[in-house]
Amino acid sequence: MKTWVKIVFGVATSAVLALLVMCIVLRPSRVHNSEENTMRALTLKDILNGTFSYKTFFPNWISGQEYLHQSADNNIVLYNIETGQSYTILSNRTMKSVNASNYGLSPDRQFVYLESDYSKLWRYSYTATYYIYDLSNGEFVRGNELPRPIQYLCWSPVGSKLAYVYQNNIYLKQRPGDPPFQITFNGRENKIFNGIPDWVYEEEMLATKYALWWSPNGKFLAYAEFNDTDIPVIAYSYYGDEQYPRTINIPYPKAGAKNPVVRIFIIDTTYPAYVGPQEVPVPAMIASSDYYFSWLTWVTDERVCLQWLKRVQNVSVLSICDFREDWQTWDCPKTQEHIEESRTGWAGGFFVSTPVFSYDAISYYKIFSDKDGYKHIHYIKDTVENAIQITSGKWEAINIFRVTQDSLFYSSNEFEEYPGRRNIYRISIGSYPPSKKCVTCHLRKERCQYYTASFSDYAKYYALVCYGPGIPISTLHDGRTDQEIKILEENKELENALKNIQLPKEEIKKLEVDEITLWYKMILPPQFDRSKKYPLLIQVYGGPCSQSVRSVFAVNWISYLASKEGMVIALVDGRGTAFQGDKLLYAVYRKLGVYEVEDQITAVRKFIEMGFIDEKRIAIWGWSYGGYVSSLALASGTGLFKCGIAVAPVSSWEYYASVYTERFMGLPTKDDNLEHYKNSTVMARAEYFRNVDYLLIHGTADDNVHFQNSAQIAKALVNAQVDFQAMWYSDQNHGLSGLSTNHLYTHMTHFLKQCFSLSD
């Protein structure tokens, strides 16, 4: 359940914005223009057309000093930073000849795969047709062509071996023109998945479309097998255009249901027929009850690190395994098992963090909670108990980007104590004591406070991508000196387009309430006057380990509501949200739907006290988890909210996915947490919707938060004889994309304007 990213973006209709959903983003303060009279407000059309979308530049690194990039005219260009030269390795003509929308260069630079006929499945997964183009002779490889459609395909890290998944089985090619070697034979639709995740592992555990991993030099290929045979199936109608609707069937474990059974295998790709795939043993303490596999990290060609998690997700085990030539198999000694346990919540943040190994190929760096309950980088050499803490403070390390022999690059929200910022730091690990430098803190201080980074091999160079609060900018830097080499993308056209737009003002501040810090972002109309009264819209997500209050740029639906319709919009990060320590994060453990709602209500009361909110015109809206929170807030009986909207809400945790739900709620059994599962439903509060205007929206083909959730809310409201408004989107999933997006935001705009008595 990751719709918070989508909410932050607002409407993502253009191709550019759609691509950006994989990143994480928000918006700026005014772009100044002295000619006030030529300025215009944002329109809903601007938002729906993606007029003010921005671009980012992530180099596709292929060495320490070279990267590929698709030019504006769709040529694939290789750039060499050191020589300053660039040349086209693949022309747009070749791309167009097979309608390619994506490409991948083999590490030996002899071949390129071209991807076409993209067909989306779930959040990350899709199928496609693949063509292999031989760069040495400028022709497509003929003979032993790849089957179609393929579920996943990738090059080996060295050379030009290919691994691919077709009809849930894994195949290997030593060279693109060779006949394939079939590695697995038991793959079966909706039953056995090899090398690709099933629905729940894709969405809630791996967050990838693949479940296979090459060893660093391509000697071995590791893969997961998911057995979904015993998982209950969610079935829903897909209406399409035919006389009879189709039924979509997905093995989908809801809370407490039977889960997938996972096994990890490794095969020697040099001699794949030698002994066949060898299973990697599961640590005994994990295998004793239901468990998950959470990630695999290759250390060397003959050492691999697997992470496992108990079904009750407060115990994680990291297991380092070695290849034994004698037996052609993998040994995972108990002495190389490292346990991570949470006593106050679940293991990790949203996911358990993954290790970043150092050059000795046994010690590693990893982010986990320190004794004060803040997530920090630790160095593990032998045991977790003896871990050396590398960062510390009342802030959190977010991500380790790269470890070289003398530097560790990471991001955190330390700078100036704003949890919604991200800066990139370098720690010199080659010297003693290690010294820390903030690489980004003072680069473009007003414009850029939220960064991510992308590193070339050995961190020789890196790209910084700044997401705001000003207009996003991407730059290239020297990995040794941190010197900026060039601007990769600065969104000049966007800057010019915004010159005559009256953008809302934005402020990020905090409320201190009963020892809890509530950070909020307030979006204010352009001519905001504190002495006047404004309608207030709360936009909420509020899911565990999410963050809505971030210093990022976005021109989206709520920007329009402030700019044109004169609303004040507020986003509040309450208990359960991330990057402010475990006390706030784990406050919601086993008790979803309580404190998240309380904190939104508390914030609204504080906003009213500020004096510029019309307390008769307050609304709340949210999507996914935010739809759940907005529904519960509307049904809280406080009388604070006049109206509200829930898009694709969860209505009962018994209806949502096991992996996500049980992480935060435990099991829906009498001897565990069934009571709170029952107490935390939206349906249980049907009666309380009587005094609010409620708009309930859902896509009928939502594979993630099933339409069932809204169907049950609607049934409960009807049974309670409570009036409400509803909109369904036929055959639309959790994202409500395409034309549905325009209809959705137009509909919600009308609803809010009516609620706030604003003229149309």
């Epitope: 030698y274 002994v275 060898q278 299973e279 005994a284 034994r324 037996w327 052609q328 198999t329």
Partner: nanobody, 119 residues
């Protein structure tokens, strides 16, 4: 469930021969390596011989090279160890092991079969 049952051990004079058998169930021996590990009091555990996969690639401990031969009958899912020119130092309990079991707890191992070389 993976199971390995060893047989064929016994008392033999120096220079004599024995043939050990290992019947496997719960997995296919052609998908793995299967072999013999011996344990003798006061000595380190030793991998005597193993045979791998479809190709039947073999490996022997230096101490048994030229005297012992490992083979497998995939149709019977059984591995064999032909031991010739036996010596007193070959006295040990011989355990059948596979890639599946060798690095796991001893719960997965068979009972073993005892070979005693003595005059």
């Amino acid at each position: 469930e993976v199971q390995l049952v060893e047989s064929g051990g016994g008392l033999v004079q120096p220079g004599g021969s024995l043939r050990l058998s290992c019947a496997a169930s719960g997995f296919n021996i052609k998908d793995t390596c299967i072999g013999w590990v011996r344990r003798a009091p006061g000595k380190e555990e030793e991998l005597v011989a193993r045979i791998c996969g479809q190709i039947g690639s073999t490996r022997y401990a230096d101490s048994v090279k030229g005297r012992f031969t490992i083979s497998a009958d995939t149709s019977k899912n059984t591995a064999y160890l032909q031991m010739n020119s036996l010596r007193a130092e070959d006295t040990a309990v011989y355990y059948c092991a596979t890639s599946y079991t060798v690095y796991r707890s001893y719960d997965y191992w068979g009972q073993g079969t005892t070979v005693t070389v003595s005059s």
